[in-house]
């Protein structure tokens, strides 16, 4: 089978600070040295890119400076963290993995992680 399997948790609850973390693991059919990981958000059949990073195996993921994502890699496993989430960002987040080099190219699409974000209640004014 030439398909690449990507596994990710079904559900994750973001912290009260709007931070959600999950692991994206892929079963590499080949010995990739350069990998691109993309987080996609799917809502109402519309898919948008949240963030993307390319890394050399053994090195750290490098997201753009203004990215809301950070991450670390270990073998065929990527630990992803998305920050600054609000309740309106609740949705399905798909992990996409591409083995860019060496040939052949492989594409792997996870089933998605449903991230639930609950905005914190505002602190009540306290009179002393």
């Amino acid at each position: 089978c030439k398909a690449m399997h990507v596994a990710q948790p079904a559900v994750v609850l973001a912290s009260s600070r709007g931070i959600a973390s999950f692991v994206c693991e892929y079963a590499s059919p080949g010995k990739a040295t350069e990998v691109r990981v993309t987080v996609l958000r799917q809502a109402d059949s519309q898919v948008t890119e949240v963030c993307a990073a390319t890394y050399m195996m053994g090195n750290e993921l490098t997201f753009l400076d203004d990215s809301i994502c950070t991450g670390t890699s270990s073998g065929n496993q990527v630990n992803l963290t998305i920050q600054g989430l609000r309740a309106m960002d609740t949705g399905l987040y798909i992990c996409k993995v591409e083995l860019m080099y060496p040939p052949p190219y492989y594409l792997g699409i996870g089933n998605g992680t449903q991230i639930y974000v609950i905005d914190p209640e505002p602190c009540p004014d306290s009179d002393f």
Epitope: A3, M4, R36, L40, M100, P103, G108, I109
Partner: antibody, heavy 118, light 108 residues
Framework: EVQLVESGGGLVKPGGSLRLSCAAS????????MHWVRQAPGKGLEWVSF????????YYADSVKGRFTISRDNAKNSLYLQMNSLRAEDTAVYYC???????????WGQGTMVTVSS | EIVLTQSPGTLSVSPGERATLSCRAS???????LAWYQQKPGQAPRLLIY???SRATGIPDRFSGSGSGTDFTLTISRLEPEDFAVYYC?????????FGQGTKVEIK
Amino acid sequence: EVQLVESGGGLVKPGGSLRLSCAASGFTFSSYTMHWVRQAPGKGLEWVSFISYDGNYKYYADSVKGRFTISRDNAKNSLYLQMNSLRAEDTAVYYCARGGLLGPFDLWGQGTMVTVSS
Amino acid sequence: EIVLTQSPGTLSVSPGERATLSCRASQSVGSSYLAWYQQKPGQAPRLLIYGAFSRATGIPDRFSGSGSGTDFTLTISRLEPEDFAVYYCQQYGSSPWTFGQGTKVEIK
């Protein structure tokens, strides 16, 4: 409007060269992989070449390897295909196509005809 | 290279009838990586189905995809006049990207 527009096709003699262009508009070009696909008259679709987001990685069909070169200019939202040592069997309509975020070719240009004949 | 074989080569169907197109892969293709395209004469292909069964934006629900592993199917539940065209399956999970040879759906 989200679209791809190819240009540069025409009639060329065997052994000649041609450069195809594909102008992208209406989307963030650098966020997508791009492909060239061709279709010989009365035949099916044949994938020709792929280029990664930043242009660092390129793949080719065996039938064009060593003769065709794919490139992109993200600043100009443009994709190119340099075709050298052309043969009669390269005669086809050439389409540029966008590799969608989930992988399939979700946006196609209208195509440009390349005829290789003496 | 994954070889995709479509059958039948030509399908003659009357408007309003159901059309079933088959695509068989030479080796297993993950269902996330199988697409169907429609092409009309003089036009570029148009994405219909991706991930074996998800309809692309704007595609009517009379088009549906199914299958897994090596066998995939495109079904058009009730053929409309504008559906008579050539249909191609494609795998996009690994290079080289490959297409089936196409199935022509013609008016009976």
